[in-house]
């Protein structure tokens, strides 16, 4: 057995605080404004001691952050004050009120439009890079809901054909800098990020250059936290793996959820030769299960010394009071069959159920 694998269900559902309110107020403030959040006692009864929390961390009162039992004030707000705020009962940690706050200093715009731009043969003998579709580059601020796909494009030309590279917040931006990776489509002069999350916010700069010169364009991405929402999952790459018998395999899944998610690693199995139960639901075995207390969780599953019976489909599943999200991971095991693996274990480890 290995890191991240358990042979029994260890969920903590019984100890989760009471249900969070279904409504999360979404508020937008301007930079420099005073953010004021009010949380009156439910039913007008006594409030009891409370604590205000931002993005999972208790707020510390200061000259700028004024904390009261029913009210929170953040003076001279800046972009860093954006986030998920909640007022909780101190003893039970039950969420009484729940706000999504965005502090903005620029108007937001909608989703990017589609369309591809191939590299163009301009017929110019030699020349520094230039933008071929500048009218498509006017939208410098992009505000999109979480889980959407974002595409930035910088269609350009020059002779020799220029190269394109991308920066995030002024630094080189590579696929490993975000869990879902990125797609660089050089032919279309584009950067694509799927299933964006709040940590993808920032300034993205394309740098187009050849030996005669360099041009650049910066876009600002704001990821809007839709709330309430079911968990958002990102699969760490590669999601599908081929492993040699006896090797170790690791799957990585990232979970985002403003409400405490119940996170599970599951594996599809057969029961009496069938992959699905009488109602058509797939049979799965629970490998790992727990409640995350953070709005963001990295979850890993490591399979040590894999055998052929470890091959198949694995699921990272996250459930909160709004809904369920799943990501599938595939493992294919191949290689010489070791003698000891001819012995088939009597029963499948874990709890099997139709899930």
């Amino acid at each position: 057995e290995s890191l991240g694998t358990e042979q029994r269900v260890v969920g903590r559902a019984a100890e989760v605080p009471g249900p969070e309110p279904g409504q999360q107020e979404q508020l937008v403030f301007g930079s420099g404004d005073a953010v004021e959040l009010s949380c009156p006692p439910p039913g007008g009864g006594p409030m009891g001691p409370t604590v205000w929390v931002k993005d999972g961390t208790g707020l510390v009162p200061s000259e700028r952050v004024l904390v009261g039992p029913q009210r929170l004030q953040v003076l001279n707000a800046s972009h860093e004050d954006s986030g998920a705020y909640s007022c909780r009962q101190r003893l039970t940690q039950r969420v009484l009120c729940h706000f999504s706050v965005r502090v903005t200093d620029a108007p937001s715009s909608g989703d990017d439009e589609d369309g591809e731009d191939e590299a163009e043969d301009t017929g110019v003998d030699t020349g520094a890079p230039y933008w071929t579709r500048p009218e498509r580059m006017d939208k410098k601020l992009l505000a999109v809901p979480a889980a959407n796909t974002v595409r930035f494009r910088c269609p350009a030309a020059g002779n020799p054909t220029p190269s394109i590279s991308w920066l995030k917040n002024g630094r080189e931006f590579r696929g490993e800098h975000r869990i879902g990776g990125i797609k660089l489509r050089h032919q279309q002069w584009s950067l694509v990020m799927e299933s964006v999350v709040p940590s993808d916010r920032g300034n993205y700069t394309c740098v187009v250059e050849n030996k005669f010169g360099s041009i650049r364009q910066t876009y600002t991405l704001d990821v809007l936290e839709r709330s309430p929402h079911r968990p958002i999952l990102q699969a760490g790459l590669p999601a599908n793996q081929t492993a040699v018998l006896g090797s170790d395999v690791e799957f990585h899944c990232k979970v985002y959820s403003d409400a405490q998610p119940h996170i599970q690693w599951l594996k599809h199995v057969e029961v009496n030769g069938s992959k699905v139960g009488p109602d058509g639901t797939p049979y799965v075995t629970v490998l790992k299960s727990w409640i995350s207390e953070s709005v963001e969780a990295d979850v890993r599953l490591r399979l040590a010394n894999v055998s052929e019976r470890d091959g198949g489909e694995y699921l990272c599943r996250a459930t909160n009071f709004i809904g369920v999200a799943e990501k599938a991971f595939w493992l294919s095991v191949h290689g010489p069959r070791a003698a000891e693996e001819e012995l088939v274990e009597a029963d499948e480890a874990g709890s099997v159920y139709a899930g």
Partner: antibody, heavy 119, light 108 residues
Framework: EVQLVESGGGLVQPGGSLRLSCIVS????????MSWLRQAPGKGLEWISY????????YYADSVKGRFTISRDSAKNSLYLEMNSLRAEDTAIYYC????????????WGQGTLVTVSS | DIQMTQSPSSLSASVGDRVTITCRAS??????LNWYQQKPGKAPKLLIY???SLQSGVPSRFSGSGSGTDFTLTISSLQPEDFATYYC??????????FGQGTRLEIK
Amino acid sequence: EVQLVESGGGLVQPGGSLRLSCIVSGFIFSSYEMSWLRQAPGKGLEWISYISSSGRVIYYADSVKGRFTISRDSAKNSLYLEMNSLRAEDTAIYYCTRKWDSSGPFDFWGQGTLVTVSS
Amino acid sequence: DIQMTQSPSSLSASVGDRVTITCRASQSISSYLNWYQQKPGKAPKLLIYAASSLQSGVPSRFSGSGSGTDFTLTISSLQPEDFATYYCQQSYSTPPITFGQGTRLEIK
């Protein structure tokens, strides 16, 4: 090979500041949660701060809240701990650690850097 | 906060002995219990995670058991290099992440 190397420790007067750095290698830094822990001379282990893989979620122990700031720079494969208003009781070896996952152990540790707060 | 209590706080034993260290949590932590070994002047090293899983590269004489609130670290046959301080740590409820106070294992 996974490696975590701390630096920035030293002698500082009460009320002073220090910035600890931890440079990591051998794994994809941007997909792991990280923490700082410390150990006062002859004492046990104390967790002091946590940062999620994206840097969006941060936690502190009550003993350092409001004085210490954790941050990370994935482009530089670096974890930081900014320590202000240092007190004698902050004297300890500070360890940079990798957290296996959200419910997992600290599977790799740096060698530690000594911070001494004394007048 | 979840409190972790280790016992004994120190222990004398001889090479070849079977040694048991216990750790108790102030509330149920399921199987989210990890054990570390620390030698003087060195950083701690992960031995056991998820209560009973042996970390890669750790000798099989080390084993862990328990669930809920009571956990045990066992060294089946003590070797000279095993004399060190051992810590338990819960990763069930965070923050804060809490450790036991440590058990110092000395040569008799």
